[in-house]
Amino acid sequence: LNTTILTPNGNEDTTADFFLTTMPTDSLSVSTLPLPEVQCFVFNVEYMNCTWNSSSEPQPTNLTLHYWYKNSDNDKVQKCSHYLFSEEITSGCQLQKKEIHLYQTFVVQLQDPREPRRQATQMLKLQNLVIPWAPENLTLHKLSESQLELNWNNRFLNHCLEHLVQYRTDWDHSWTEQSVDYRHKFSLPSVDGQKRYTFRVRSRFNPLCGSAQHWSEWSHPIHWGSNTSKENPFLFALEA
């Protein structure tokens, strides 16, 4: 017995023989195939998407999702009320702001309604899954003849976010980057007035309010300085 299973990242996995033979004797029936993993992200604490790879199922299956919060006033089992679909098959669930409790253990259960004993239950720390919106309203101020200050806004509690600023001139092959704490401002002490600078910023829900690994999208870039660098050999490649 060696059943091939398509895993959530699209790779074939031939661990089914182990799955079916190595569990302790009070396990579920041997016909039980593993369900896809659920991955959840909380977008700016406005809504949360919990998704799974529906194509990993041997045949198209409308899997169902239930959720609750462990040891809290919200520990009643809830049915997903807003499914996401991929090719008319359930592939996720969207939860709204009022259903998100960041600092309680979130329990999510995926189930095959045709075979109810086929279910998988995961636990998640939502505070580690927050992805903020990209920083907005980037502005540049000249503090002195050679010093620039970059400021930006976030549509979230500022003290919860850390930031990464990247900048480069039209002469640079790569970005220079600098980590910035919750203060959401960055100073560049030495600016060359003959060069054109580009800045961009992204943010992360870390480390004061959570331990998220995922960054926001990059902000729209903001530019400073000379628009004409005729002798710049990299200009056209960078702007292509």
Partner: nanobody, 126 residues
Framework: EVQLVESGGGLVQAGDSLRLSCVAS????????MGWFRKAPGKEREYVAI???????FYEDSVEGRFTFSRDNAKNTVYLQMNSLRPEDTAVYYC????????????????????WGQGTQVTVSS
């Protein structure tokens, strides 16, 4: 072939400590969700501690604050430090592993685990 081997069980008095170890051979545990489960006579198997490979760890209510899960990827080993043991902790303790794609996946459902050890007996006398 993947093998999980638990050790560290035994007979102890209430209030004592034990440290269970689970060593894997045949594949790395660095990208596996891990779980410690237990089965007491006449009871359902239950999770004790579960962990994603990203480091998020969860405990069953009755062991929270007494038991600690840890892993050493270099040694391909996970541990369960059990302090302030109680008679109701008496059970066979199993280590389980599930290769996962996402760093945040931690399973409390036993049927989600692909690999299991044979178990180690923990007996706590009053």
């Amino acid at each position: 072939e993947v093998q999980l081997v638990e050790s560290g069980g035994g007979l102890v008095q209430a209030g004592d400590s034990l440290r269970l170890s689970c060593v894997a051979s045949g594949r790395t545990l660095s990208r596996c969700a891990m779980g410690w489960f237990r089965k007491a006579p006449g009871k359902e198997r239950e999770y004790v501690a579960i962990s994603s490979w990203g480091g998020d760890t969860f405990y069953e209510d009755s062991v929270e604050g007494r038991f600690t899960f840890s892993r050493d990827n270099a040694k391909n080993t996970v541990y369960l430090q059990m302090n302030s043991l109680r008679p109701e902790d008496t059970a066979v303790y199993y280590c389980a592993a599930a290769p996962t794609s996402f760093a945040t996946t931690a399973y409390s459902s036993s049927n989600s685990y692909a690999y299991w050890g044979q178990g180690t007996q923990v007996t706590v006398s009053s």
